[in-house]
């Protein structure tokens, strides 16, 4: 099941995924002055079985001045945006797929890509935050968002972060500690059925992820 | 079920402090971050300051120069707020409220008057 | 600072009517943007977050718009129980600023 809506957005901070769970799609965007080749895909999909996931399909871009199909040469990593604004200053440095059965990694960029990378996540995804360059973290709760099904519909849970400037007058008594992950506040739709897949990874991870694989600028 | 319940009115004299207690039941305290907002008689609200009730950083309103400090007991799952120097015009509700997430303030406290009367 | 002008700062309507509040903000606010509903004796309450998003269990008559600087809330059909206080707030810079209000009343 597709998730409906976006992530949730924070001021001044960024989303990522660490892997993509099976049934994500990705569109095959290329970028200024470049199209699909013809009869080539519309997006890639994630998919697998118990053992093995990868994305099907492939993204090729042409150039929309010339009818020849794209060269296929080693792609090299240029900047990217993940389905809203935020640019992605360098490529994801996913975790090791075996600890994540049913999930994809970061498909490497293509040739020619779009400077945004739009997804389309499935229930169950789990996305990271960290304030982005230039700004630190006032308040770290669980700091993660995940696709569940409530009611019948997707929502997205809250993640809890809050980023302040570092010029702004803040007052850090101490450096933060990795967050463990509590329980969490009960939701208001808490009186019904939630599923959601058994996709954890150690909320720890999101606190000492490399900075490399968030954005570094959002405005 | 949520809930931040406040500490009971003041009256206070002009150059006088006050501290207010807001104790939260219901949900995990160190997962979100704790505002403080000031509302005088008749009039709009003023975001005070906010604290991480996970690691105790803070932000404040220079709007109240230095007079606002905002705590946490994580012990007993209750965030403070202390105003000092009080004068006449910091006669006010003072609400404290959590920040969830996409939006700053979803559950607050019932509000404490402060009566700063010589 | 980033401050918020709101306006009007009253307003009388019958109910039915359609009712519009505006909001600006001193620069580009990202649409990090909430509207409350407060009642007297009683503490605010979200309708709006990021502009445009209906917190649950708001009455769909409630409807926010805007990006950048400007900002709208708008009521369709104004019922006995929307006569309150409407502010706006901004939550993309600290520190957190609110509109003055905006008291709707019904005639």
């Known amino acids: 099941e597709l998730c409906d809506d976006d992530p949730p957005e924070i001021p001044h901070a960024t989303f990522k995924a660490m892997a993509y769970k099976e049934g994500t799609m990705l569109n095959c965007e290329c970028k200024r002055g470049f199209r699909r080749i013809k009869s080539g895909s519309l997006y890639m999909l994630c998919t697998g079985n118990s053992s093995h996931s990868s994305w099907d399909n492939q993204c090729q871009c042409t150039s929309s001045a010339t009818r020849n199909t794209t060269k296929q040469v080693t792609p090299q990593p240029e900047e990217q945006k993940e389905r809203k604004t935020t640019e992605m200053q360098s490529p994801m440095q996913p975790v090791d797929q075996a600890s994540l059965p049913g999930h994809c990694r970061e498909p490497p960029p293509w040739e020619n890509e779009a400077t945004e990378r739009i997804y389309h996540f499935v229930v169950g995804q789990m996305v990271y935050y960290q304030c982005v360059q230039g700004y630190r973290a006032l308040h770290r709760g669980p700091a993660e968002s995940v696709c569940k099904m409530t009611h019948g519909k997707t929502r997205w849970t809250q993640p809890q972060l809050i980023c302040t400037g570092e010029m702004e007058t803040s007052q850090f008594p101490g450096e933060e500690k990795p967050q463990a992950s509590p329980e969490g506040r009960p939701e208001s739709e808490t009186s019904c059925l939630v599923t959601t897949t058994d996709f954890q990874i150690q909320t720890e991870m999101a606190a000492t992820m490399e900075t490399s694989i968030f954005t570094t600028e959002y405005q | 079920e949520v809930q931040l319940v406040q500490s009971g009115a003041e009256v206070k004299k002009p150059g006088a402090t006050v501290k207010i207690s807001c104790k939260v039941s219901g949900y995990t305290f160190t997962d979100y971050a704790m505002h403080w907002v000031q509302q005088a008689p008749g009039k709009g609200l003023e975001w005070m300051g906010v604290?991480?009730?996970?690691?105790?950083?803070?932000n404040y309103n220079q709007k109240f120069k230095g007079r606002v400090t905002i705590t946490a007991d994580t012990s007993t799952d209750t965030a403070y707020m202390e105003l000092s120097s009080l004068r006449s015009e910091d006669t006010a509700v003072y609400y404290c409220?959590?920040?969830?997430?996409?939006?700053?303030?979803?559950?607050w406290g019932q509000g404490t008057l402060v009566t700063v009367s010589s | 600072d980033i401050q918020m002008t709101q306006s009007p700062s009253s307003l009388s309507a019958s109910v039915g009517d359609r009712v519009t509040i505006t909001c600006k903000a001193s620069q580009d606010i990202n649409s990090y943007l909430s509207w409350f509903q407060q009642k007297p004796g009683k503490a605010p309450k979200t309708l709006i977050y990021?502009?445009?998003r209906l917190v649950d269990g708001v009455p769909s008559r409630f409807s926010g718009s805007g990006s950048g600087q400007d900002y709208t809330l708008t009521i369709s059909s104004l019922q006995p129980e929307d006569m309150a206080t409407y502010y706006c707030?901004?939550?993309?810079?600290?520190?957190?600023?609110f509109g003055q209000g905006t008291k709707l009343e019904i005639k």
């Open positions: 707030l901004q939550y993309d810079e600290f520190p957190y600023t």
């Open positions: 409220a959590t920040s969830y997430g996409n939006y700053p303030f979803d559950y």
């Open positions: 990021r502009a445009n």
């Open positions: 604290i991480s009730t996970y690691n105790g950083n803070t």
